[in-house]
């Protein structure tokens, strides 16, 4: 059976697959997914290995019309480095010489300057090029190689291994060489895979059942460390509770060198954040940190300095801490907007069972703002999801030059932020460089400011506007108001009407349904429309909602289904990548972010059309 990294190399024109007959004969044959000789896989960024022979595809020289055969894998050899060129061409790196079918006289696969159909290759059974099943480095644990990646294939006791192995062991622990020749170099590490006993790589906090893995012997960059945690279905450490910090201080007390944690300020327009999307509500900086030096965007925990945190350049090589298991945040469930009949007094705006009001003109210090909100039956607003934040920005009349108190503060326990209404902190969205918590002026209260409504800590004595929030009073069954300019069941935002398509549909079906409604699959023109849509669908239980974006027409170029320019994007991490397909909005923790899906997947969708009675503004000229 093929494992997910293996593939057959298929030429559509001949309808045949590459077949490694012997190390010196790489030919083609009728495709057979059970034939070991037809299975290949990437073993580095640029090397392709024959699974049958554990040897790599290569050439004797970078010249036209030479045979491609198999060689002992050598990551340094220029003659074994392949790259995908435009679309389905596979070429030797740095040259316009391509992997080619050969011809009637030449049965072997050849290196050739021609880029026609005989030089075009796909993964058998898909429309994807060979790079779509690319190599993912596997970072090792423990061992003696400082967490280096597995080198496949590697030689151990004169035998070649293309996968992690338990050879030499009686306990089933899986390991790999980190150079091609373990016998000579003696460098290895354990694989970040599940095997009997692998739980002893983790320390479980008996109080919370959260597990931590301290990789103090590794030397990885922040991004590599994060990848290593993710390969174990974990994330770089986040710390949101004082108890958690205490437990980790104890766990790392015998160590001296810094260890990467998930805290970073890598997002271009926002501040400090945890890589696992936990709220940044507890601060434990080393005195003098975070330093404002550019480039110091990643954070390490310093065991030698009472486990306090320091920001460093992300390319430094350090050990790291991974975290997995129950997170306490999931216990607080925010009801979806559609589940709660929301009735609000005049001048208050409804959302998901609560009512909101901006007090912009009567400026108050935080304590007085809180008192006013409480007198009105509410509290300074708490914000628990990106959807709720986006509702405030897109529908409450929030303005880009606003600076408004919200309920977050660390008045009770220094460096530990809490909501004034007592609800748990499940979400934060700090401005770049925030929270700064400058000690010379006690910054214990939090404001929302700037075009995105992100947050900053502020001295509580500043007179500012504020946002109140209260529980709505349920009025029995909700009366569905028909929004002016929109049909019943459609929701108005600015000049447009929007509707959620409730039948699970492929992209094409969703598009057709919208067209039948004299509408189209939604476009997203800017941050504010995105904010509206995030608050519209983000809390719903379904995972995805189709938008009108796809690269169906021209692979690699994403276009809306209607004649409109793509002027704004909101991609999820690692998107769009090399994947062709159609774009859907995520819900839940990644609410609103765009993922590329296969167009025949079924999802709900959002239709959009101009509201009636709206004068169309002129199209912007570029």
């Amino acid at each position: 059976l093929l494992d997910t990294r293996q593939f057959l190399i298929y030429n559509e024109d001949h309808k045949r697959c590459v077949d490694a007959v012997s190390p010196s004969a790489v030919q083609t044959a009728a495709c057979n997914q059970d034939a070991e000789s037809q299975k290949f896989r990437w073993v580095s960024e640029s090397q392709i290995m024959s699974v049958a022979f554990k040897l790599c595809l290569g050439v004797p020289s970078k010249t036209d019309w030479v045979a491609i055969t198999l060689y002992a894998c050598d990551s340094k050899s220029e003659f074994q480095k392949w790259e995908c060129k435009n679309d389905t061409l596979l070429g030797i790196k740095g040259e316009d010489l391509f992997f080619n079918y050969g011809n009637r006289q030449e049965k072997n696969i050849m290196l050739y300057k021609g880029s026609g159909l005989w030089s075009r290759w796909k993964i058998y059974g898909t429309t994807d090029n060979l790079c779509s099943r690319g190599y993912e480095a596997m970072y090792t644990l423990l061992g003696n190689a400082n967490g280096a990646t597995c080198a496949f294939p590697f030689k151990f006791e004169n035998k070649w291994y293309a996968d992690c192995t338990s050879a030499g062991r009686s306990d089933g622990w899986l390991w790999c060489g980190t150079t091609t020749d373990y016998d000579t170099d003696k460098l290895f590490g354990y694989c970040p895979l599940k095997f009997e006993g692998s739980e002893s790589l983790w320390n479980k906090d008996p109080l919370t059942s959260v597990s931590y893995q301290i990789n103090s012997k590794s030397a990885l960059t922040w991004h590599q460390a994060r990848k290593s945690c993710q390969q174990q279905n974990a994330e770089l450490l986040s710390i949101t509770e004082i108890h958690e910090q205490t437990y980790l201080t104890g766990l790392t007390s015998s160590l001296t060198s810094g260890l990467w944690i998930g805290l970073n300020s890598l997002s271009f327009n926002s501040g400090w954040q945890w890589s696992d999307r936990s709220p940044f509500r507890y601060l434990n900086w080393l005195p003098g940190s975070p330093s404002a030096e550019p480039g110091k965007s990643c954070v390490s925990l310093n065991p030698g300095k009472n486990a306090k945190w320091e920001n460093l350049e992300c390319v430094q090589k350090l050990g790291y801490i991974c975290k997995k298991g129950n997170t306490t945040l999931n216990s607080f469930v925010i009801p979806s907007e559609s589940d709660v009949p929301t009735h609000c007094p005049s001048q208050w705006w409804p959302y998901a069972g609560h009512c909101y009001k901006i007090h912009r003109d009567e400026k108050k210090i935080q304590r007085d703002a809180l008192t006013t909100c409480r007198k009105e039956g509410g509290d300074l607003t708490s914000i628990h999801t990106i959807e709720e934040l986006d509702f405030i920005i897109s529908q409450l009349g929030y303005e880009p030059n606003d600076e408004l108190w919200i309920g977050l503060n660390d008045i009770k326990i220094q460096m530990y932020f809490e909501w004034s209404d007592g609800t748990p902190v499940t979400f934060t969205k700090w401005l770049r460089g925030e929270p700064s918590h400058e000690n010379n002026r006690q910054e214990d209260c939090v404001v929302m400011k700037g075009k995105d409504g992100y947050w900053a800590d502020r001295g509580c004595e500043w007179p500012l506007g504020y946002i109140c929030k209260m529980k709505s009073r349920s009025q029995g069954p909700e009366i569905v108001e028909v929004e002016k300019g929109c049909r019943k069941g459609w929701k108005k935002h600015h000049f447009y009407c929007y509707m959620i398509g409730h039948t699970l549909s492929t992209f094409a079906e969703a598009n057709q349904t919208c067209n039948n409604e004299n509408a189209y699959l939604t476009t997203i023109e800017d941050r504010y429309e995105q904010a509206f849509l995030t608050s519209f669908v983000g809390l719903r239980p379904e995972k995805y909602f189709w938008t009108g974006l796809s690269d169906i027409q021209t692979k690699g170029t994403f276009q809306w289904t209607i004649e409109e320019e793509v002027r704004f994007t909101h991609w999820n991490s690692d998107m769009p990548g090399r994947k062709p397909g159609c774009v859907a909005m995520r819900t839940g923790i990644a609410g609103g972010l765009w993922d590329v899906l296969k167009c025949d997947e079924k999802a709900k969708f959002v239709c959009k059309h101009w509201a009636e009675g709206v004068t169309h503004p002129p199209k912007p000229t570029t």
Partner: nanobody, 120 residues
Framework: DVQLVESGGGLVQPGGSLRLSCAAS????????MAWFRQAPGKEREIVAA????????YVADSVKGRFTISRDNAKNTVYLQMNSLKPEDTAVYYC?????????????WGQGTLVTVSS
């Protein structure tokens, strides 16, 4: 690397008791199992008792069940074999084996052995 040091062997009369201990040292991340084997003159090496690392579940060979017990002190990376009601047929060199996670991919390490002689 990993060293195993056995102690506690010696000469004992039939019906007597001995306690063997085996201490593991070196760059050990974790010990997945520790066991005692024995080899009598002219015979194959056989397992006597073993203790699992994680669960601390134990195994004792039928030939010594009820007389021998194995225990482990995780903090000291040490395993003990308490031998009671010893018989002449228990005479052998007793070897300690540890299955460890260390800085080589090999897992199995053996001690040098300690001689137990049961004789009147």
């Amino acid at each position: 690397d990993v060293q195993l040091v056995e102690s506690g062997g010696g000469l004992v009369q039939p019906g007597g008791s001995l306690r063997l201990s085996c201490a593991a040292s070196g760059s050990i991340f974790t010990i997945n199992a520790m066991a005692w084997f024995r080899q009598a003159p002219g015979k194959e090496r056989e397992i006597v008792a073993a203790v699992n690392g994680g669960s601390s579940s134990t195994y004792v060979a039928d030939s010594v069940k009820g007389r021998f017990t194995i225990s482990r002190d995780n903090a000291k990376n040490t395993v003990y074999l308490q031998m009671n009601s010893l018989k002449p047929e228990d005479t052998a060199v007793y070897y300690c084996k540890a299955v460890v996670v260390t800085t080589t991919p090999y897992s199995d390490y053996w001690g040098q052995g300690t001689l137990v002689t049961v004789s009147s």
